[in-house]
């Protein structure tokens, strides 16, 4: 899980070692600060939870691909 | 493609212990989140617990909490399930069941093992 | 957890009649932000997993006859069969894959009149 230790900035210390299913995934958010120790991708599932992953992951950058696309289109 | 393949069918006594196997090939059990589902003679479908990435951990359906480990070596790719102090009513059909990246449900079962339990 | 409810429990329908099978959520399985239905029915014969014939509640699986249609959304559901053949007999399924546990309908049995 993200921990946000000095808020407002929210750092990963692990990642999860599964991959989602890209349909259970609603959002993402990079984490690029220096003040924490990695680069990661907070996914926000449908239900709410967020989860911590790896950005060199092929399917971390495949999920936020599909997200990326589904954002573009509008629904009808 | 993923491919589940079941360990065969197993008599047991009341009170005895199952293990079931559910070997993985076409991807690795990392990649996969494991889930188990029992049928009963004519009885329909029960979720008894899988995986769930999104809380990274192992969570049972709470009518088998105390009886049931679901465990997985990465090494051969191979989940197992046991229930232990089995009682006649589980005699069932037992299946390994797991979803594609792609998907959410369940698109790739195992064959089904059947557990007897009879004295 | 999420209980799922089918009705019938069972349906007897001539060959080339239409069955129509319900199947009725406690809570919404809907996921406003992409207006998808975290819904899946499956089709089970005796000794044989269950078989995915629609998912997100109206999308048919590939290879699915198109005698096959689901429709509903929310917390209600219902699966067509439009013209009924020997073949479709076995055991229906709904599952909601919406939040854990999945939980599945009891199952209604389809047979021939």
């Known amino acids: 899980q993200p921990d946000a230790i000095n808020a407002p900035v929210t750092c990963c210390y692990n990642f999860t070692n599964r991959k989602i299913s890209v349909q259970r995934l609603a959002s993402y958010r990079r984490i690029t600060s220096s003040k924490c120790p990695k680069e990661a991708v907070i996914f926000k599932t449908i239900v709410a939870k967020e989860i911590c992953a790896d950005p060199k992951q092929k399917w971390v950058q495949d999920s936020m691909d599909h997200l990326d696309k589904q954002t573009q289109t509008p629904k009808t | 493609q993923v491919q589940l393949v079941q360990s065969g069918a197993e008599v047991k006594k009341p009170g005895a212990s199952v293990k079931v196997s559910c070997k993985v090939s076409g991807y690795t059990l990392t990649e996969l989140s494991m889930h188990w589902v029992r049928q009963t003679p004519g009885k329909g479908l029960e979720w008894m617990g899988g995986f769930d990435p999104e809380d990274g951990e192992t969570i049972y359906a709470q009518k088998f909490q105390d009886r049931v480990t679901m465990t997985e070596d990465t090494s051969t790719d191979t989940a197992y399930m046991e229930l232990s102090s089995l009682r006649s009513e589980d005699t069932a059909v037992y299946y390994c069941a797991t979803n594609d990246f792609w998907t959410g449900y369940y698109d790739y079962w195992g064959q089904g093992t059947l557990v007897t339990v009879s004295s | 957890d999420i209980v799922m409810t089918q009705s019938p429990d069972s349906l007897a329908v001539s060959l080339g009649e239409r069955a129509t099978i319900n199947c009725k959520s406690s809570?919404?399985?809907?996921?406003?932000?992409?207006?998808?239905?975290?819904l899946v029915w499956y089709q089970q014969k005796p000794g044989q997993p269950p078989k995915t014939l629609i998912y997100?509640?109206?999308t048919r699986e590939s290879g699915v006859p198109d005698r096959f249609s689901g429709s509903g959304s929310g917390t209600d559901f219902t699966l067509t069969i439009s013209s009924l053949q020997a073949e479709d007999v076995g055991v229906y399924y709904c599952?909601?894959?919406?939040?854990?546990?999945?939980?599945f309908g009891q199952g209604t049995k389809v047979e021939i009149k």
């Open positions: 809570q919404s399985v809907l996921y406003s932000s992409n207006n998808k239905n975290y």
């Open positions: 599952q909601q894959y919406y939040t854990s546990p999945w939980t």
């Open positions: 997100w509640a109206s």
